[in-house]
């Protein structure tokens, strides 16, 4: 088996529908071409549940799975599904084997599928297989985001990867939520990052021949505190007919725990405003953001008295925000008439 020889299944003929799960060991750097179904009606190839695109280094195209040069991250489970159905035509796992340098011409051409078949091969210190994926060194992300660091590498023997944080072995045991180490993907994933995750993350890739390392710098930015933000245009001016139901909506965004009130502007002694200059209001609904449907004000079976100005008031430890809308209630007998309502407003 030459190092350049392709790993290839049977030609692209009509497949047996009784495909058994197969395991193929592929040498690093070796091209791969696997077929599934007839070329014109070939199945779709998936890797780990994701459909392969028809272009790229690893591609699924006209029933073929083609890998230009097999890399460690190409290892994994591949499925070929018949077009327009979920029938599995191929179910196989590709395993990274040692790269080959020499062999006998009369060797069994399928011998590479047997992991126990050993070959002499040159030892090679670890090297980065996708340095372009590692160019971003400085990472500044908002608290709560997910961070993924990757150090795709290869070598002979296949290297191992370890992660350090600020120079110390890192397993995530002291981290709330832990970490995900995906050795097959040479990756470290941290979800919901917090300020204590700041620091230097080093991937250390080693084999018997040598080692390489790469540093990622992570900064976690705390969200700047602000008063609640209300979605523009909500609540919206609404026109309803007497006897109908109305919903007013208010969308609130706040990092700090917000408190929401629905207010109706009222008139007292012929005046809308008190001596202090503030409007007279009636509190209709009050709750925290996590209360059920607090952001919606329901008005059932509205009457003419329900017409007027309604305000969504949201506050947190930093400040208050509010936006208002007008409800116009029309008599039942004249539903075509509409009143011009003032614009909803947002005040600092």
């Amino acid at each position: 088996l030459e190092a350049s020889e392709e790993v290839e299944l049977e030609p692209c003929l009509a497949p047996s529908l009784e495909q058994q799960e197969q395991e193929l060991t592929v040498a690093l750097g070796q091209p791969v071409r696997l077929c599934c179904g007839r070329a014109e009606r070939g199945g779709h190839w998936y890797k780990e549940g994701s459909r392969l695109a028809p272009a790229g280094r690893v591609r699924g195209w006209r029933g073929r799975l083609e890998i230009a040069s097999f890399l460690p991250e190409d290892a994994g489970r591949y499925l070929c599904l018949a077009r327009g159905s979920m029938i599995v035509l191929q179910n196989l796992t590709l395993i990274t084997g040692d790269s080959l340098t020499s062999s006998n011409d009369d060797e069994d051409p399928k011998s590479h599928r047997d992991p126990s078949n050993r070959h002499s091969y040159p030892q090679q210190a670890p090297y980065w297989t996708h340095p372009q994926r590692m160019e971003k060194k400085l990472h500044a992300v908002p608290a709560g985001n997910t961070v993924k660091f990757r150090c795709p590498a290869a070598g002979n023997p296949t290297p191992t990867i370890r992660w350090l944080k600020d120079g110390q072995a890192f397993h995530g045991e002291n981290r709330i939520g832990g970490i995900r180490l995906r050795h097959q993907h040479w990756s470290l994933v941290m979800e919901s990052v917090v300020p204590s995750d700041r620091g230097t993350y080093t991937c250390l890739v080693e084999n018997a021949v040598g080692s390489i390392r790469y540093n990622y710098l992570l900064d976690v930015l705390e969200r700047s505190p602000h008063r609640p933000i209300l979605q523009a245009g909500l609540p919206a001016n609404t026109t309803a007919v007497v006897g109908s139901d109305v919903e007013l909506l208010c969308k609130v965004y706040s990092d700090a725990q917000p408190h929401i009130q629905w207010l109706k502007h009222i008139v007292i002694n012929g005046s809308s405003f008190g001596a202090d200059g503030f409007p007279y209001v009636q509190v209709l609904k009050t709750a925290d953001i996590n209360s059920s449907e607090v952001e919606v004000l329901y008005l059932r079976n509205v009457s003419a008295e329900d017409a007027g100005e309604y305000t969504c008031l949201a506050g947190n430890s930093i400040g208050l925000s509010y936006q208002s809308a007008w409800l116009t209630v029309l008599p039942e007998e004249d539903p075509t008439w509409t009143a011009a309502a003032p614009e909803a407003r947002y005040t600092d």
């Epitope: 600020d166 300020p195 390489i212 790469y214």
Partner: antibody, heavy 119, light 112 residues
């Protein structure tokens, strides 16, 4: 206008201290890593120190480790370099520089401030 | 002694092509991208080439960069008198001590 403006340089005796400042304007200072780079008279560039946008992580060249402290005040858009136990070999023009997001190269430099350590 | 090695000087006549080399190791150039800075006499350095071969806006296409293995180079074609300056290569270094930025010693370019 996007710019960095250093200040605080001057003449100081060996063993003395000095604090350099770098005022940033025209960009979101708090989300950028920032560095100090120095250049001794007639010599090449030497990276001195780096600080993350939050100020939570700092990094130093071996030559200044334990003597210099980098810090920042994001509310004032200002970067600092506190230099203690100064030596004659610290004499240089000190530049403050912005590390571009992600890749970390220096895409914006200040005009520099001269620090002279001499008795 | 700089971590990255550059020739101390280079020269050329107007219109000529000049190349400046920068040599490093697996922990810096071998693992990271290379950036080049131009420092005109009496001024602060300026970014010239980033990520091995990218030019910031405003930098003429006469300047180009490349990287191979643990070495990089800066090429200047159609040399002009205003190109007379010091040129520095730089890269991150993933040393045992943590991340550092390392520079070359600089190359003084003279336009004859």
């Amino acid at each position: 206008e996007v710019q960095l403006l250093e200040s605080g340089g001057g003449l100081v005796q060996p063993g003395g201290s000095l604090r350099l400042s770098c005022a940033a304007s025209g960009f979101t200072f708090s989300s950028n890593y920032m560095s100090w780079v120095r250049q001794a008279p007639g010599k090449g560039l030497e990276w001195v120190s780096l600080i993350s946008g939050s100020g939570g992580s700092t990094y130093y060249a071996d030559s200044v480790q334990g003597r210099f402290t980098i810090s920042r005040d994001n509310s004032k858009n200002t970067l600092y370099l506190q230099m203690n136990s100064l030596r004659a070999e610290d004499t240089a023009v000190y530049y403050c520089a912005r590390n571009t997001a992600g890749f970390g190269y220096f895409d914006l430099w200040g005009q520099g401030t001269l620090v002279t350590v001499s008795s | 002694q700089s971590v990255l090695t550059q020739p101390p000087s280079a020269s050329g006549t107007p219109g000529q092509r000049v190349t400046i080399s920068c040599s490093g190791s697996s922990s810096n150039i071998g693992s990271n991208t290379v950036n080049w800075y131009q420092q005109l006499p009496g001024t602060a350095p300026k970014l010239l080439i980033y990520r091995n071969n990218q030019r910031p806006s405003g930098v003429p296409d006469r300047f180009s960069g490349s990287k191979s293995g643990t070495s990089a180079s800066l090429a200047i074609s159609g040399l002009r008198s205003e190109d007379e300056a010091d040129y520095y290569c730089a890269a991150w270094d993933d040393s045992l001590n943590g991340p550092l930025v390392v520079f070359g010693g600089g190359t003084k370019l003279t336009v004859l």
